[in-house]
Interface confidence: low
Amino acid sequence: DPASKSRSCGEVRQIYGAKGFSLSDVPQAEISGEHLRICPQGYTCCTSEMEENLANRSHAELETALRDSSRVLQAMLATQLRSFDDHFQHLLNDSERTLQATFPGAFGELYTQNARAFRDLYSELRLYYRGANLHLEETLAEFWARLLERLFKQLHPQLLLPDDYLDCLGKQAEALRPFGEAPRELRLRATRAFVAARSFVQGLGVASDVVRKVAQVPLGPECSRAVMKLVYCAHCLGVPGARPCPDYCRNVLKGCLANQADLDAEWRNLLDSMVLITDKFWGTSGVESVIGSVHTWLAEAINALQDNRDTLTAKVIQGCGNPKVNPQGPGPEEKRRRGKLAPRERPPSGTLEKLVSEAKAQLRDVQDFWISLPGTLCSEKMALSTASDDRCWNGMARGRYLPEVMGDGLANQINNPEVEVDITKPDMTIRQQIMQLKIMTNRLRSAYNGNDVDFQDASDDGSGSGSGDGCLDDLCSRKVSRKSSSSRTPLTHALPGLSEQEGQKTS
């Protein structure tokens, strides 16, 4: 009946016009559909041009929906990153401020004449946390070696101590432990704490980066066809009230987002590793305890040096010979100031606990983000049928959708009835992002064991002996340059989106 056919085109006119397209494209009454390339070729209210316009629009709408979902996740990760980064930086800044406020009174010139060395140490710890390509153990070793030379000179102003004597002092120091247990303790605890903190924050950065990059992956032409058929073909075929069958929608989106679903395994691994490493934030070697109390180890070290001064001097003279007396120099420094130690255990502020529990909950919520995308988009962005199964749009007509729902990921789309997916051609951007996830997971797993992956096996003799615990007192027998207190490699592992001098971002 021509009248009913022309009536059905009225609804298409309404939808088509609402999308901003010209109504002059829309036929007054249904026409034969041999020209249709995507929709089934029955009687239709859509011309070729309309079909093409609607296909492009449905494609754009799906990409927008995909970006919206990704943006929510990205925002969550970015917020987490900022919160943790602020907290960790705050801990270190607090420690440095305490040092600057208390050390002049506690140690007098022993501190004031070496303030630059302490400042440089904090700068290097900050750089390391932010991802600089520093070897933390070496950084600490060089700090102690430099400090020992300078303090020894200050404690013995009456002696002439040329460079070769100071080199000998450095070699003796390993056995003498002039700073007591503090350097070793600080090294062991700081390495684990800083590695854990920086890898966790880097993990958040990488996760956010992956989401951003994957959201930009274009949907292929086969997906466009399938989404057009899913969303608008019912209108073209005169069944505009029929909503898509849920399983039909899922199959279309599983086909369209097949590559994205392949992120699932490595995404879960990354989030698991991130949740796991938060275990390293607590206890005496935990992030909060260690980063916030670096100054107490430094105070302990200077006190130990002063306490051991006479024994140390005797042993150094034994090993290195009698140094010449400086005729211009004053007598030996007798006034000793002993720095009163602040309690090493910082009372937990509760901030980190709150941050971690929130992060754990949110990371758990987004674990299945990639495989749940088809379901999420179908249920949230599509007006799916809730009517009985045989009344929904199945891609051909109103009726039951019979094919089974495909599994997740590229390999499972081999028989997807809705989207022709070439399972032999994975998307390269997504493969690269899978690799980034894998790489970051490796870093976190190493960090969990207290290792910094960038410096595993980086021993000077090239013997591949692990992360190396060879120095008894963090003072290995090495010459230390007295020229510069901070000749460091620039950032090469910067955290994404954090520092002004970012170096090279992880991608």
Epitope: R431, K438, A458, G503, Q504, S507
Partner: antibody, heavy 127, light 106 residues
Framework: AVTLDESGGGLQTPGGTLSLVCKAS????????MFWVRQAPGKGLEFVAG????????LYGSAVKGRASISRDNGQSTVRLQLNNLRAEDTGTYYC????????WGCGAYSAGDIDAWGHGTEVTVS | ALTQPSSVSANPGETVKITCSGG???????YGWYQQKSPGSAPVTVI????KRPTDIPSRFSGALSGSTATLTITGVQVEDEAVYYC??????????FGAGTTLTV
């Protein structure tokens, strides 16, 4: 001691298929990434293909992309390179190389900067 | 490709530095240095992962990475160090790349 033994080289015909095998011993094969690198006569080193420890990722140099396939058998400690549609410019010495870093506790990169041991090479002539 | 000088020369006992730049910029910059004494002979790794040295390589060979430039340093170069040195890294798509080689003449 680490040993990497390449085999399968020799005279090949243009348009044909090359199949090289590298047999590894002296280290935990299943924990490391493996690469094939080649060197044309009088030229420098060129990355051909790479595969990670559990064969999750395979990587190919631009000159062989679409023609090469790298695979590994961790049970046999072998890595294989297949190169189809051979050309004269595929002539050269093909080296098998291992990296020290496993992907489980990795050094964080899939890089020709990771190579810590090389095979002696197998010569391939396409003519 | 990676950029390295085509040749350097030195007298025995001198210190030689060879630079290499242009590796992948994602922040995981790893460089290796490979010595080849004659064409067709197998390369030998002298440095991998920027600064690691295989156990059988003399301590006069060292590596460092500063920014995105890797440097191979041979302190007290010897006649037997004469060779072509290739640096290796990767591009931004993770594909391995090598420099064209630096001929060291002692």
């Amino acid at each position: 001691a680490v040993t990497l033994d390449e085999s399968g080289g020799g005279l090949q015909t243009p348009g044909g298929t090359l199949s090289l095998v590298c047999k590894a011993s002296g280290f935990d094969f299943s924990s490391v990434n493996m690469f094939w690198v080649r060197q044309a006569p009088g030229k420098g080193l060129e990355f051909v293909a790479g595969i990670d420890n559990d064969a999750t990722f395979t990587l190919y140099g631009s000159a062989v992309k679409g023609r090469a396939s790298i695979s590994r058998d961790n049970g046999q400690s072998t890595v294989r390179l297949q190169l189809n549609n051979l050309r004269a410019e595929d002539t050269g010495t093909y080296y098998c190389a291992k990296t020290l870093c496993s992907t489980t506790w990795g050094c964080g990169a899939y890089s020709a900067g990771d190579i810590d041991a090389w095979g002696h090479g197998t010569e391939v002539t396409v003519s | 490709a990676l950029t390295q000088p085509s040749s350097v020369s030195a007298n025995p006992g001198e210190t030689v530095k060879i630079t290499c730049s242009g590796g992948g910029s994602s922040g995981y910059g790893y460089y290796g240095w490979y010595q080849q004494k004659s064409p067709g002979s197998a390369p030998v790794t002298v440095i991998y992962n920027n600064n690691k040295r295989p156990t059988d390589i003399p301590s006069r060979f060292s590596g460092a990475l500063s920014g995105s430039t890797a440097t191979l340093t041979i302190t007290g170069v010897q006649v037997e160090d004469e060779a072509v040195y290739y640096c290796g890294s990767r591009d931004n798509t993770y594909v391995g790349i090598f420099g064209a080689g630096t001929t060291l003449t002692v």
